[in-house]
């Protein structure tokens, strides 16, 4: 046989005996002569070449470039490959010696008593256990133990090679301590040395670069990656980098496998790779590559070298953020920077907290953003190594849809005099400001529940047939003013008025607020009454713990039954777009109150008095009648708004003055409280008493002190009371100059 | 100063009558409304009727509606309380009450002075 390429110039050595495989028996001498065209050299079984002592190589006597291997009594441990080849040169030519040792019929290995064979738990791979042969043809089986197992060659994967061994799927015999091949001549079974079986693993499962990404250092800086890869058990790893500087001074590379937990099914190793000083050429792409021998697994991370500590915002960086109210608002700090830089918030030249509604970081976020949010936010990067600053203003704009004040305020149902003028208002709070408020209207009995109907508090009114106030056509007579703004609560909001000039018919009202950002809108319920009438007593807003009472006079030959009611808590809330229901087509939402039935020649006057008025009693008020013929119910609706006692508190300040003999004094003492405070002045701790100089008017406010006298310099005391106190301010008048003596004298 | 003056109370039998007077002095009855109240033992000081400035309407608690009669004589300052038919429940101390020129006194917020009081009893 022959090995390797035929040279143009050269020819392949050759052998005495031309076969590629001979057979001889155990102790007969082999001897093979091998001629060519240079020098050549003889490499044999087990020792493949060198000082083994029965083996003797010697030169031809008949010719240059010859050379003859003979070994005296041969066993069956010569069995195998002898080569005879050119020096230096890849041209061999190659005869394959079998030597039949009966009693031997496996080659043995020269020093091991046993073997070690090397395995893969992979159902795909194979495993050679090298059990040679020294006759070709034997049926030779595999044992395995603990406990015993035997493989026969199948004729697909599990096979014997004389020359190369027993070849069987690695998972068969994973389970075992050891293996050997056993042979079996003329009913005699002979048996190879043990091979140990090591079972080796070489599943990777990942490889992880930390840090994994965003590496960026300035020239000068250390860089260190570290690679860990984690594996089954019993694997070895290599690891490989690649990077952009190979040829690096500073760079060093540190393998190590790391701990892992008793009873773990992992194994995990770590290489270092450290560069002390970076420069510009180490920035690029850094892989690191683990391999087991049948797998490889590799991961990347690029390398960032800046010249320099920097900082910069990206041109992302936002200067305008409009959000609307209630909204999550989230401002990024973009930058472009190394080290990554020290960030702070302010917002009008305050530093802003982080707490549970603002969180100040990378990005600023508002959880649920307000109208108090608006304003600009500037944001100011550090470098932490330069100290350099950059700073950035963000301008934050809250939109708020369309609020009606009203809808808080006023009663869902009230009730209107027929035939009387009467002005519905909506008052608008939008940013920006609506840019339309439009009216609708309809008909009352067309979308009100009939009695017999189930009312659905969120869906009252069966029908939404809006019409717009220009066609008033079966309705009321209305004109729409125009649109005023006020400041109110120190917001600028937008009042629509409508007027009816004569509540004929009951109807529902809505009024409508848009802007860019949404949409509010008021439903008014104007029921119009010729029924009963109702009056409050005093006519006015009572305060907490004053008494009040509510009249609720009808016609006695009109109707009969008059009941006072409290309007209860809607079951549920109005929501926008919905209607409120009419109050005497849903008796559930109300409760009956104790009232005292008093008549005259025309009237029934029904009177609840609220005695002690507390927050409690406000509310909204019924008087239901039924009319005597129809039997139909009337309900006529009052708001109650019980106004809350307040301690005096007088606004301004007197000032101290200096006036000239002769002059007048006048000065205001404007008090506030509820109930409303009482005014008195003093002078001098003693009460002041009016006469033809002194003249205090508006209950006591203004206080005029004419043609003043050296006598009215003093003290003089405002001091406003009520049942709950007292509050008073103080000045002193200096009046100069002399005094001019009277005609009397 | 105003001063309220009732008189009339007495005890009668169940079925009979009475007439109370109340004198107003310091305060015009014309110009103002005036009313009648009354308490019985354990209860609340209740309206029983009123009359309004002027004397043009005149108002009764439904308990004695038909059977009670308030009126005023503008000369006398005073205002008068004709009660027929009595009952054993109209027992109770009668109270003149004076109040603003509207409403009239029928409940007691709306009542500015109050007279002393005059019992009236009536055995069944």
């Known amino acids: 046989a022959s090995v390797g390429l035929p040279s143009v110039s050269l020819d392949l050595p050759r052998l005495s005996i031309q076969k590629d495989i001979l057979t001889i028996k155990a102790n007969t001498t082999l001897q093979i002569t091998c001629r060519g065209q240079r020098d050549l050299d003889w490499l044999w079984p087990n020792n493949q070449s060198g000082s083994e002592q029965r083996v003797e190589v010697t030169e031809c006597s008949d010719g240059l470039f010859c050379k003859t291997l003979t070994i005296p009594k041969v066993i069956g441990n010569d069995t195998g490959a002898y080569k005879c080849f050119y020096r230096e040169t890849d041209l061999a030519s190659v005869i394959y010696v079998y030597v039949q040792d009966y009693r031997s019929p496996f080659i043995a290995s020269v020093s091991d008593q046993h073997g070690v064979v090397y395995i893969t738990e992979n159902k795909n791979k194979t495993v050679v256990i090298p059990c040679l042969g020294s006759i070709s043809n034997l049926n030779v089986s595999l044992c395995a133990r603990y406990p015993e197992k035997r493989f026969v060659p199948d004729g697909n994967r599990i096979s014997w090679d004389s020359k190369k061994g027993f070849t069987i799927p690695s998972y068969m015999i994973s389970y075992a301590g050891m293996v050997f091949c056993e042979a079996k001549i003329n009913d005699e079974s002979y048996q190879s040395i043990m091979y140990i079986v090591v079972v080796v693993g070489y599943r990777i499962y990942d490889v992880v670069l930390s840090p994994s990404h965003g590496i960026e250092l300035s020239v000068g800086e250390k860089l260190v990656l570290n690679c860990t890869a984690r594996t089954e058990l019993n694997v070895g790893i290599d690891f490989n980098w690649e990077y952009p500087s190979s040829k690096h001074q500073h760079k060093k590379l540190v393998n190590r496998d790391l701990k892992t937990q008793s009873g773990s099914e992992m194994k995990k190793f770590l290489s270092t790779l450290t560069i002390d000083g970076v420069t510009r050429s180490d920035q690029g792409l850094y892989t690191c590559a683990a391999s087991s021998g049948l797998m490889t697994k590799k991961n990347s991370t690029f390398v960032r070298v800046h010249e320099k500590p920097f900082v910069a915002f990206g041109s992302g960086m936002e200067s305008l953020v409009e959000a609307t109210v209630g909204e999550r608002v989230r401002i990024p700090a973009k930058y472009l920077g190394y080290p990554p830089p020290e960030i702070k918030w302010y917002k009008n030249g305050i530093p802003l907290e982080s707490n549970h509604t603002i969180k100040a970081g990378h990005v600023l976020t508002i959880m649920e953003v307000s109208e108090r949010d608006t304003g600009n936010y500037t944001v100011i990067l550090t470098n932490p190594i330069s100290k350099e600053k950059q700073s950035h203003v963000v301008s934050l704009v809250v939109y708020v849809p369309p609020q009606i004040g009203e809808k808080s305020l006023i009663s869902p149902v009230d009730s209107y005099q027929y035939g009387t003028t009467q002005t519905l208002t909506c008052t608008v709070y939008a940013i920006p400001p609506p840019h339309h408020i439009h009216w609708y209207w309809q008909l009352e009995e067309e979308c009100a529940n009939e009695p017999s109907q189930a009312v659905s508090v969120t869906n009252p009114y069966p029908c939404e047939e809006w019409r717009s106030v220009e066609d008033f056509q079966g309705g009321n007579k209305i004109e729409v003013n125009k649109n005023q703004f006020a400041l109110i609560e120190g917001k600028n909001k937008t009042v629509s008025t409508l007027v009816i000039q004569a509540a004929n018919v009951s109807a529902l009202y809505k009024c409508e607020a848009v802007n860019k950002v949404g949409r509010g809108e008021r439903v008014i319920s104007f029921h119009v009454t010729r029924g009963p009438e109702i009056t409050l007593q005093p006519d006015m807003q009572p305060t907490e713990q004053e008494s009040v009472s509510l009249w609720c006079t009808a016609d006695r030959s009109t109707f009969e039954n008059l009941t006072w009611y409290k309007l209860g808590p809607q079951p549920l809330p109005i929501h926008v777009g919905e209607l409120p229901t009419p109050v005497c087509k849903n008796l559930d939402t109300l409760w009956k109150l104790n009232a005292t039935m008093f008549s005259n020649s025309t009237n029934d006057i029904l009177i609840m008095e609220l005695k002690n008025a507390s927050l409690q009693d406000q509310g909204d008020y019924v008087c239901l009648a039924q009319d005597r013929k129809t039997k139909k119910r009337h309900c006529v609706v009052r708001q109650l708004t019980v106004l809350e006692r307040v301690a005096p508190t007088i606004t301004g300040n007197l000032e101290n003055q200096t006036t000239s003999i002769g002059e007048s004094i006048e000065v205001s003492c404007t008090a506030s409280g509820n109930p409303p405070p009482q005014i008195m002045w003093f002078k001098d701790n003693e009460t002041l008493v009016e006469d033809s100089g002194i003249v205090l008017k508006d209950g006591n406010r203004n206080l005029t002190i004419r043609r003043v006298r050296k006598e009215d310099e003093g003290l003089y005391t405002c001091q406003a009371c009520s049942v709950l106190g007292c509050a008073k301010v103080e000045a002193f008048f200096i009046i100069e100059g002399a005094q001019e003596k009277t005609n009397l004298e | 100063q105003v001063q309220l003056q009732e008189s009339g109370g007495g005890s009668v039998q169940a079925g009979g009558s009475l007439r109370l007077s109340c004198v107003a002095s310091g305060y015009s009855v014309s110009k103002n409304s005036m009313g009648w109240f009354r308490q019985a033992p354990g209860k609340e000081r209740e309206g029983v009727a009123g009359?309004?400035?002027?004397?043009?309407?005149?108002y009764y608690a439904n308990s004695v509606k038909g059977r009670f009669t308030i009126s005023q004589d503008n000369a006398k300052n005073t205002v008068y309380l004709q009660m027929n038919t009595l009952k054993p429940e109209d027992t109770a101390i009668y109270y003149c009450?004076?109040?603003?020129?509207?409403?009239?006194?029928?409940?007691?917020?709306?009542?500015?002075?109050w007279g002393q009081g005059t019992q009236v009893t009536v055995s069944s």
């Open positions: 009450a004076a109040g603003s020129p509207d409403p009239p006194p029928l409940i007691e917020s709306v009542v500015k002075y």
């Open positions: 009359i309004n400035e002027g004397g043009t309407a005149t």
